[in-house]
């Protein structure tokens, strides 16, 4: 069941998922000057069964200028560099090791992909938050949000995270020095 809305926004933070539950959609978005090809699904879908899940459909982008030409994509990892910081890339390597039943890993990039990935998450999905570069994390609790179903409606739990500039006081009175992100957090794609 799809979550009705997007995960909460935290100022100066991005959220990511370690793995994606079956039923998750990833919109096939293209960078400026390119558009999704006219045939093929508008999104990729995490599909499968409890033992094996994978992304169904392939996103393809074609030049907006040459409307009639379509380009078969071969994922090019170098396309990622304009979308991820070095820190995120190192976290990605951890995510690649994750294999949860009924979940998909981060799909590889496609040629001329947009800079931001737009996911439609499903109930039960957890996303993890991390402060952007130059900001420190102050934790009052878990820096994560879970999409839950209550009374027939979906809602995201509120992550207990505040991101503060390096020059500001970096911790609440009486708290220990906070970590930049939850211990050993395997991050995946940026989503906001």
């Amino acid at each position: 069941e799809l979550c009705d809305d997007d995960p909460p926004k935290i100022t100066h933070a991005t959220f990511k998922a370690v793995a994606y539950k079956e039923g998750t959609m990833l919109n096939c978005e293209c960078k400026r000057g390119f558009r999704r090809i006219k045939s093929g699904s508008p999104y990729m879908l995490c599909t499968g069964n409890s033992s094996h899940s994978s992304w169904d459909n392939q996103c393809q982008c074609t030049s907006s200028a040459a409307r009639n030409t379509t380009k078969q994509v071969t994922p090019q990892p170098e396309e990622q560099k304009e979308r991820k910081t070095t820190e995120m890339q190192s976290q990605m390597q951890l995510a690649d090791q994750v294999s949860l039943p009924g979940h998909c890993r981060e799909p590889p990039p496609w040629e001329n992909e947009a800079t931001e990935r737009i996911y439609h998450f499903v109930v039960g999905q957890t996303v993890y938050y991390q402060c952007v570069q130059g900001y420190r994390a102050l934790h009052r609790g878990p820096a994560e949000s879970v999409c839950k179903m209550t009374h027939g409606k979906t809602r995201w739990t509120q992550p207990q995270l505040i991101c503060t500039g390096e020059t500001e006081p970096s911790q609440f009175p009486g708290e220990e020095e906070p970590q930049a992100s939850p211990d050993g957090l395997p991050e995946s794609e940026t989503s906001r």
Partner: antibody, heavy 114, light 107 residues
Framework: QVQLQQPGAELVRPGTSVKMSCKAA????????IGWVKQRPGHGLEWIGD????????NYNEKFKGKATLTADTSSSTAYMNLSSLTSEDSAIYYC???????WGQGTLVTVSA | DVVMTQTQKFTSTSVGDRVSVTCKAS??????VAWYQQKPGQSPKALIY???YRYSGVPDRFTGSGSGTDFTLTISNVQSEDLAEYFC?????????FGGGTKLEIK
């Protein structure tokens, strides 16, 4: 809560044009395509086209090219559809949809009458 | 254009029964099919995406199945509030197209 607000009705003269709105709320407007669908009794549902407010891309059903023009105003999170050279065939309910058709507006009833 | 055919214009059932609504695509559309429910005087409501995945808030008595060209929406334990018209839609290629609809009547 995701909402797509559309005006209830528009009464217009033949040969003129009408611009209907679809105001989005409860999600990031520039992230998702807005689609438009026509419904006429006995004709079922017809997809007119869609627009990506973030990139300002649009796609049209060939049948509606020259008839419909899709635009979006990101500052007000509102999508618009302009229908030109109206005839009785254009009398219908027009729905806007978003987030891969998960959400639909209440529809605007367009009546073309002299 | 891909033609989506719903051969049954009407189907009649009783409360508590199980009913199936079928849809046939004129060419392979993979699993890129959605189902919608439209009650009289209301806008369509999304029930199923990607042929078999339910949207949130949709009762689990609604089940979608199929791939390629043949698709089915099954309603088990039909309730009186299921009285509506049901449409299939393909979004595998532009222009997206809908089936003609099947009206569910409750005996």
């Amino acid at each position: 809560q995701v909402q797509l607000q559309q005006p209830g009705a528009e009464l217009v003269r033949p040969g003129t044009s009408v611009k209907m709105s679809c105001k989005a709320a409860g999600y990031t407007f520039t992230n998702y395509w807005i689609g438009w669908v026509k419904q006429r009794p006995g004709h079922g549902l017809e997809w007119i086209g869609d627009i990506h407010p973030g990139g300002d891309y649009s796609n049209y059903n060939e049948k509606f090219k020259g008839k419909a023009t899709l635009t979006a105003d990101t500052s007000s999170s509102t999508a618009y559809m302009n229908l030109s050279s109206l005839t009785s065939e254009d009398s219908a309910i027009y729905y806007c949809t978003s987030r891969n058709f998960a959400y639909w507006g209440q529809g605007t009833l367009v009546t073309v009458s002299a | 254009d891909v033609v989506m055919t719903q051969t049954q214009k009407f189907t009649s059932t009783s409360v508590g029964d199980r009913v199936s609504v079928t849809c046939k695509a004129s060419q392979n559309v993979g699993t890129n099919v959605a189902w919608y429910q439209q009650k009289p005087g209301q806008s369509p409501k999304a029930l199923i995406y990607s042929a078999s995945y339910r949207y949130s808030g949709v009762p689990d008595r609604f089940t979608g199945s199929g791939s390629g060209t043949d698709f089915t929406l099954t309603i088990s334990n039909v309730q009186s509030e299921d009285l509506a018209e049901y449409f299939c839609q393909q979004y595998n290629s532009y222009p997206y197209t809908f089936g003609g609809g099947t009206k569910l009547e409750i005996k």
